[in-house]
Interface confidence: medium
């Protein structure tokens, strides 16, 4: 049924109002059922087929063939102690386009996500001869001329105005009903910009001959990578080991990753050099650095850059 109290429609198209106690109306066939219109100076004028050749009345439905500008106003359905009211606003058709801007439904679709447009009109289904789907007012090549459908993974090129135009005959006249969607394709909003946790520069106090574990943690997407860079050539120092990366999924569906660089039997060559941890994604990279400092020298380092 037509439950929305405020309705905007375009002139020249078939249109209907269906009251919401339809099943009840069938049960009480003998009950008087009336449709009224009020607009401006005219208060509660009862509608009947003699009111206009464009109006058709059924038990549950008031049909317009088609609706015109002067149909703007308030409509009432009355049956016993049940009343339903609608405010109808009929707007001008855009003569220079295949659709009217004020009658557009906007949809946002993420790129690579499933994107579907199906041209259906359940109420007029039996009267529809054919249906065409247009993109930016140009007809698309779709085989099914009863219910044209687009089903695909969205690409940025899919952005545009899609208009389903249903062509139907009634009493020897040809009518069309247009439903337009403004499809906007956006970047995959589910992807985050990966970030390394903690300070960008970390001084770590160590003792020669001992071991240290440098922990690099990041919040990232599933396909992002986290890695260590150190020395002239990674892997040239047999005392340096990259431990297996640990990943835990967050409640939001992102990943918390942790990768440890283990330095055993720390020597002079390990001091005052940069051990860089990087997280890389399609959106860019983030890097944090660790510098090993001899415990005896730690007094020279400001407290706020010191990390245990």
């Amino acid at each position: 049924c037509t439950s929305r109290p405020h309705i905007t429609v375009v002139e020249g198209e078939p249109f209907y109002l269906k009251h919401c106690s339809c099943s009840l109306a069938h049960e009480i066939e003998t009950t008087t059922k009336s449709w009224y219109k009020s607009s401006g100076s005219q208060e509660h004028v009862e509608l009947n087929p003699r009111s206009s050749s464009r109006i058709a009345l059924h038990d549950c439905v008031l049909e317009f063939w088609p609706v015109e500008l002067n149909d703007t106003g308030s409509y009432f359905f009355q049956m016993k102690n049940y009343t339903q009211k609608w405010k109808l606003n009929v707007i001008r058709r855009n003569k220079h386009s295949c659709f009217t801007e004020r009658q557009v439904t906007s949809k946002i679709v993420e790129v690579k996500k499933f994107f579907q447009i199906t041209c259906e009109n359940s109420y007029y289904q039996t009267l529809v001869n054919s249906t065409s789907l247009y993109k930016n007012c140009k007809k698309l090549l779709l085989e099914n001329n009863k219910n044209p459908t687009i089903k695909k993974n969205a690409e940025f090129e899919d952005q545009g105005y899609y208009s389903c135009v249903h062509f139907l005959h009634h009493n020897g006249k040809l009518f069309n009903i247009t439903k337009t969607f403004n499809i906007t394709i956006v970047e995959d909003r589910s992807n985050i910009v990966p970030v390394l946790l903690g300070p960008k520069l970390n001084h770590v106090a160590v003792e020669l001959g001992k071991n240290v574990r440098l922990n690099c943690s990041a919040l990232l997407n599933e396909e992002d990578v986290i890695y260590w860079m150190f020395g002239e050539e990674n892997g040239s120092d047999p005392n340096i080991h990259e431990e297996k990366e640990m990943r835990i999924m967050t409640p939001e569906g992102k990943w918390h990753a942790s990768k440890v660089l283990r330095i055993e039997n720390i020597g002079e060559s390990n001091l005052n050099v940069l051990y860089n941890c990087t997280v890389a994604s399609t959106g860019g990279t983030d890097t944090k650095s660790f510098i090993l400092v001899r415990k005896a020298d730690m007094a020279d380092i400001p407290g706020h850059v010191f990390t245990r």
Epitope: K138, L140, E143, E157
Partner: antibody, heavy 118, light 107 residues
Framework: EVQLLESGGGLVQPGGSLRLSCAAS????????MSWVRQAPGKGLEWVSA????????YYADSVKGRFTISRDNSKNTLYLQMNSLRAEDTAVYYC???????????WGQGTTVTVSS | QPVLTQPPSVSVSPGQTASITCSGD??????ASWYQQKPGQSPVLVIY???NRPSGIPERFSGSNSGDTATLTISGTQARDEADYYC??????????FGGGTKVTVL
């Protein structure tokens, strides 16, 4: 890999017949409309014929109407062009191409050469 | 039979912009596509739906279509862009039409 491979070209006398085939692979053949496009030596592209994915709709250029028949066998992933009453002006490289619903003729075969000469 | 008219040739210096036009009655009401064809090769789609670029086609290729004219623009033309270019318009349903082709020469 998405691929189209034409075959069946050759030398034929005027008034003769030839059947071109186009074998498709790497995609769901029945979901796509297909077309034949030709190119005479040293000339531009000329659309010849097209067929809907189901085979229910066929379309022809005026120059070949009544002489050429486009068809497809979706079970064999193959497109055909039956060419009858061939004329010298039908001499060309014939390409088969895939048409997508959003007006992308995105995949073309390598072409097969048809020569009509006595 | 409707006709699509293209200039036979367009010359352009490397790094400059080449514009190829395609004219036809109310062409802007139809979807236009553009193809690049190099000698001995099959055509390659460079623009579809007037202005959309298939993946793998460089950003220097762009298209527009309004009124009676569709235009293919190649910005910062490179030597490898030297080829024949064909416009295509979809007349109705699966029927289509090609322009006569334009030979782009990079000087």
């Amino acid at each position: 890999e998405v691929q189209l491979l034409e075959s069946g070209g050759g030398l034929v006398q005027p008034g003769g017949s030839l059947r071109l085939s186009c074998a498709a692979s790497g995609f769901t053949f029945s979901s796509y409309a297909m077309s034949w496009v030709r190119q005479a030596p040293g000339k531009g592209l000329e659309w010849v014929s097209a067929i809907s994915g189901s085979g229910g709709g066929t379309y022809y250029a005026d120059s070949v109407k009544g002489r050429f028949t486009i068809s497809r066998d979706n079970s064999k992933n193959t497109l055909y062009l039956q060419m009858n009453s061939l004329r010298a002006e039908d001499t060309a490289v014939y390409y088969c191409a895939r048409i997508r619903g959003d007006y992308r003729t995105d995949i073309w075969g390598q072409g097969t050469t048809v020569t009509v000469s006595s | 039979q409707p006709v699509l008219t293209q200039p036979p040739s367009v010359s352009v210096s490397p790094g400059q912009t080449a514009s190829i036009t395609c004219s036809g009655d109310k062409l802007g009401d139809k979807y236009a596509s553009w193809y690049q064809q190099k000698p001995g090769q099959s055509p390659v789609l460079v623009i579809y739906q007037d202005s959309n670029r298939p993946s793998g086609i460089p950003e220097r290729f762009s298209g527009s279509n309004s009124g009676d004219t569709a235009t293919l623009t190649i910005s910062g033309t490179q030597a490898r862009d030297e080829a024949d270019y064909y416009c295509q318009a979809w007349t109705h349903s699966l029927s289509t039409l090609f322009g006569g082709g334009t030979k782009v020469t990079v000087l």
